[in-house]
């Protein structure tokens, strides 16, 4: 999947655009908003009716090297009595993000953009029930 | 991808850090995943904390379209299909990396940008405090 060119007619390619070899693009990995602190709701993962745990995956050849993945703790959902209700389902909610992958080929290194699917949390859903004949 | 020769010390000296600027292949690696969450699942309608999806479009960003979730209710849907306000619908937020055209409007020059998106909603049982 290629990154689309700027297709809008009102865009003029500025003179200041850096020269880039064909088939590639220049990427500055100094992240915009890197230090922006977000106030996430405190421990929603354990107060949710579809609670989840977090696992950190680490890969030195990926940027960022740390990616956090969520896993639903239960198949069912937690009811008002604190018990698991298996008539409901805990399901993962996923979001795509971009990472930069470093590849080594002999004494050379190349970089590739990669889409990664991250599980960010879980939600409780009413299952669709089919009765099989 | 685009290969960059390593420094003369190769293979002994391995640079652990990523360089500040890299040349990357225009092709993005990974299964052509479905970027429209409405098509990929109907959890947003079946959840006890349902949400609506709003399209956020920005031609200076890749991906140019990002879907933002907004919880439909303050409370959660109970077994009778009514909103139970003793529970909370809470957005699940995630920081993601996108590409920002830099300088603006340049077709093949980007910078990584971190943005916060609401991906969906979950139902939460709040701890209750009575204020004296």
């Amino acid at each position: 999947r290629k990154i689309p060119k700027v297709g809008h007619t009102f865009f003029q390619k500025p003179e200041s655009c850096p020269p880039v070899p064909g088939g590639s693009m220049k990427l500055d990995i100094g992240i915009i908003n890197e230090n922006q602190r977000v106030s996430m709701s405190r421990n929603i993962e354990s107060r949710s009716t579809s609670p989840w745990n977090y696992t950190v995956t680490w890969d030195p050849n990926r940027y960022p090297s740390e990616v956090v993945q969520a896993q639903c703790r239960n198949l069912g959902c937690i009811n008002a009595q604190g018990k698991e209700d298996i008539s409901m389902n805990s399901v993962p909610i996923q979001q795509e993000t971009l990472v930069v992958r470093r590849k080594h080929q002999g004494c050379s290194v190349s970089f590739q953009l990669e889409k990664v699917l991250v599980t960010v949390g879980c939600t409780c859903v009413t299952p669709v029930i089919h009765h099989v004949q | 991808g685009i290969t960059i020769p390593r420094n003369p010390g190769c293979p002994n000296s391995e640079d652990k850090n990523f360089p500040r600027t890299v040349m990357v292949n225009l092709n993005i690696h990974n299964r052509n995943t479905n970027t429209n969450p409405k098509r990929s699942s109907d959890y947003y309608n079946r959840s006890t904390s349902p949400w609506n999806l709003h399209r956020n479009e920005d031609p200076e960003r890749y991906p140019s379209v990002i879907w933002e979730a907004k919880c439909r209710h303050l409370g959660c849907i109970n077994a009778d299909g009514n909103v139970d306000y003793h529970m909370n619908s809470v957005p699940i937020q995630q920081e993601i990396l996108v590409l920002r055209r830099e300088p603006p409007h340049c077709p093949n020059s980007f910078r990584l940008e971190k943005i916060l998106v609401s991906v969906g909603c979950t139902c939460v049982t709040p701890i209750v405090h009575h204020v004296a």
Epitope: S41, I44 | P126, V128
Partner: nanobody, 116 residues
């Protein structure tokens, strides 16, 4: 710790209006929503109205829709409930609620009596 100060309760006649106010102070950051419940003797507390902090989305109980209006002032961490066309069945103790997603704070309540 979070403090909630409710005001505006009192005795009014049917058809009259009343405005309830609630001010939050202390560590009231990351607000999810702010609103009001009410309770009459021997009954459970019922939701009246709520306003989401992030986008001012409002929700009302069916029994008050079209008569009550909830509004907020972000800069002051306050929420107001404008109650119009009051009915005898609106008589209750009204509780301010501050919701921080995983923690919820209840005020002490203010009495509203609608009687001729």
């Amino acid at each position: 710790e979070v403090q909630l100060v409710e005001s505006g309760g009192g005795l009014v006649q049917p058809g009259d209006s009343l405005r309830l106010s609630c001010a939050a102070s202390g560590r009231a950051n990351s607000i999810n929503w702010f609103g009001w419940f009410r309770q009459t003797p021997g009954k459970e507390r019922e939701f009246v109205a709520g306003i989401r902090w992030s986008d001012a989305y409002t929700e009302y109980a069916n029994s008050v829709k079209g008569r009550f209006t909830i509004s907020r002032d972000n800069s002051k961490n306050t929420v107001d409930l404008q109650m119009d066309s009051l009915r005898p069945e609106d008589t209750a103790v009204y509780y301010c609620v501050l919701d921080l997603s995983t923690v919820r704070y209840w005020g002490q309540g203010t009495l509203v009596t609608v009687s001729s």
